[in-house]
Interface confidence: low
């Protein structure tokens, strides 16, 4: 997170830290005791699927305070439409090997109903993004969990206000822009997969996933987030279905 | 709708403006007051737009030049007071007033619903947690706010 602040311990209780072979991989969001939402691109280069760990209740990576809960990732489900190395359909649903125990420091973020997300949450201007990613473009990653308040843009406004880059990916209907184009604040590498959380009448909801951008906090560019509302039914259907074998699964979308 | 104007100076008004066409200046002479002249002139020059009683559901009408304004009773709204305010209680309008989820129903009022781990209160719009750790709440902040002294 560039230009954010430390999320006080326990105030981002749905934040997940994903590790592979003990190394920091990505962020994620707990949506109930056994399921985590993250970004598909986080898993493009994974070879040791059985060494994926999700950590809940984490705050400061440099110390163990007893509130952390680690779980093996039993399954990573990615939409069939996602192509590794690209930006569209950048979402993954992770099944934990064992459920986490909900505590003051481990709480799920609500996965909203689609219509509510599209016609109400999408019009809440500011939302929080969080993670242990880089504090500057090409800089060091954070030890303490960072959080940033970002305004959401309509895609048309995002395109109009963004500097044109030749090979820049399209902003599709499965994404949205949020943040600042003045180079001051943005999510960054290492935050990928983490939550874009929107507050409405006392409750927080998952509205986006940290996905991609032109560098981090680059002048003339906004952060791009996976539009979770497009995947609500897909996620719910998968969470209801019988477990399928295999760590990495491609599930038909839509 | 504007009969009160005719009570002001019946003789002059009949003579100058009803029997033959009068000008704004002649009307001004009759009423001696700019505001009253204007009210009369709006109705006189382009007809009384309130004559057809366009305001429904007990609304009162005010004539305007080529137009009119309805003043509605509290339960109604719309150009002609034709819409019952409850009919505007639909999900696209401020989430239908619901705290969480909203469902529209044809012929009946919208209904509010709550996420798993919450239940709907008697007011029909608010949600209250039914589990210790409902989604989307931050326990540390909830407890901090609950322990704050309450104003009296």
């Amino acid at each position: 997170i560039v230009g954010g602040k430390v999320c006080p311990k326990g105030e981002c209780p749905w934040q997940v830290l994903l590790l592979v072979n003990g190394a920091q991989l990505c962020g994620g969001t707990l949506i109930n005791t056994i399921w985590v939402v993250s970004a598909a691109h986080c898993f493009d280069k994974i070879k040791n699927w059985r060494n994926l760990i999700a950590v809940l209740g984490e705050h400061d990576l440099s110390e163990h305070d007893g509130d952390e809960q680690s779980r093996r990732v039993a399954q990573v489900i990615i939409p069939s439409t996602y192509v590794p190395g690209t930006t569209n359909h950048d979402i993954a649903l992770l099944r934990l090997h064992q459920p986490v125990v909900l505590t003051d420091h481990v709480v799920p973020l609500c996965l909203p109903e689609r219509t509510f997300s599209e016609r109400t949450l999408a019009f809440v201007r500011f939302s929080l993004v969080s993670g242990w990613g880089q504090l500057l473009d090409r800089g060091a990653t954070a030890l303490e969990l960072m959080v940033l308040n970002v305004p959401r843009l309509m895609t048309q406004d995002c395109l109009q206000q963004s500097r044109k880059v030749g090979d820049s990916p399209n902003i599709t209907e499965y994404m949205f822009c949020a943040g600042y184009s003045d180079g001051s604040k943005d999510s960054c590498k290492g935050d990928s997969g983490g939550p874009h959380a929107t507050h409405y009448r006392g409750t927080w909801y998952l509205t986006g996933i940290v996905s991609w951008g032109q560098g981090c906090a680059t002048v003339g560019h906004f952060g791009v987030y996976t539009r979770v509302s497009q995947y609500i039914e897909w996620l719910q259907k998968l969470m209801r279905s019988e477990p399928r074998p295999g760590v990495l699964l491609r599930a038909p979308f839509p | 709708a504007n009969a009160f104007l005719e009570e002001l100076r019946p003789g002059s008004l009949e003579r100058e403006c009803k029997e033959e066409q009068c000008s704004f200046e002649e009307a001004r002479e009759i009423f001696k007051d700019a505001e009253r002249t204007k009210l009369f002139w709006i109705s006189y020059s382009d007809g009384d737009q309130c004559a057809s009683s366009p305001c429904q559901n007990g609304g009162s009408c005010k004539d305007q030049l080529q137009s009119y304004i309805c003043f509605c009773l509290p339960a109604f709204e719309g150009r002609n007071c034709e819409t019952h305010k409850d009919d505007q209680l639909i999900c696209v309008n401020e989430n239908g007033g619901c705290e969480q989820y909203c469902s529209d129903h044809t012929g009946t009022k919208r209904s509010c619903r709550c996420h798993e781990g919450y239940s709907l209160l008697a007011d029909g719009v608010s949600c209250t947690p039914t589990v210790e750790y409902p989604c989307g709440k931050i326990p540390i902040l909830e407890k901090r706010n609950a322990s704050k002294p309450q104003g009296r």
């Epitope: 990615i78 074998p245 295999g246 990495l248 038909p252 979308f253 | -």
Partner: antibody, heavy 122, light 107 residues
Amino acid sequence: QVQLQESGPGLVKPSQTLSLTCTVSGYSISSDSAWSWIRQPPGKGLEWIGYIYYSGSTNYNPSLKSRVTISVDTSKNQFSLKLSSVTAADTAVYYCARSVNYYGNSFAVGYWGQGTSVTVSS
Amino acid sequence: EIVLTQSPATLSLSPGERATLSCRASQGISDYLHWYQQKPGQAPRLLIKYASQPATGIPARFSGSGSGTDFTLTISSLEPEDFAVYYCQNGHSFPLTFGQGTKLEIK
């Protein structure tokens, strides 16, 4: 390089149990993947019999389910097929196979044994 | 179960020609369709996975397309070694099923 090799009797009497073993080399059977059995009657198409996943879970073709058992012996890096109450209709070339572990659930079969011919006859 | 119907049953072409093989699913299977080539006395070989992704080591003349219920395997310019039987496979839901095959023979 992953290699699979089927072994077992080439002739089985009707009503008996057909038993085949697949030995996997160049890859640990317990590390991932679905390990399948597929058969092909003479001059006909391919029929999926079932698989065992590295975790031990199995999935069988409903048309054969009542007669099929697939098991794994991780110590020998082998998995086996047992098909009971065989008839002449079970005469086929039997292939053992490993599904491509690109994304696990679609069972694109990237590795095959060379096949073993089994005839059911008295 | 998902039934895959391949057409034509037999396709007679000459080397250098373009071959187009069709596979139709009885219900939508997204892109969960794979293509195999089988030569006499040999095990099948995976050509295309997920409708359009070439398997490792497959020549560029083989390509796949389609999604949902209609799928096509195209061989842009036939080589002598391409004459074989081609099968499509449903990888979408159990039981896993194969098409009945298309035999590609030399004209």
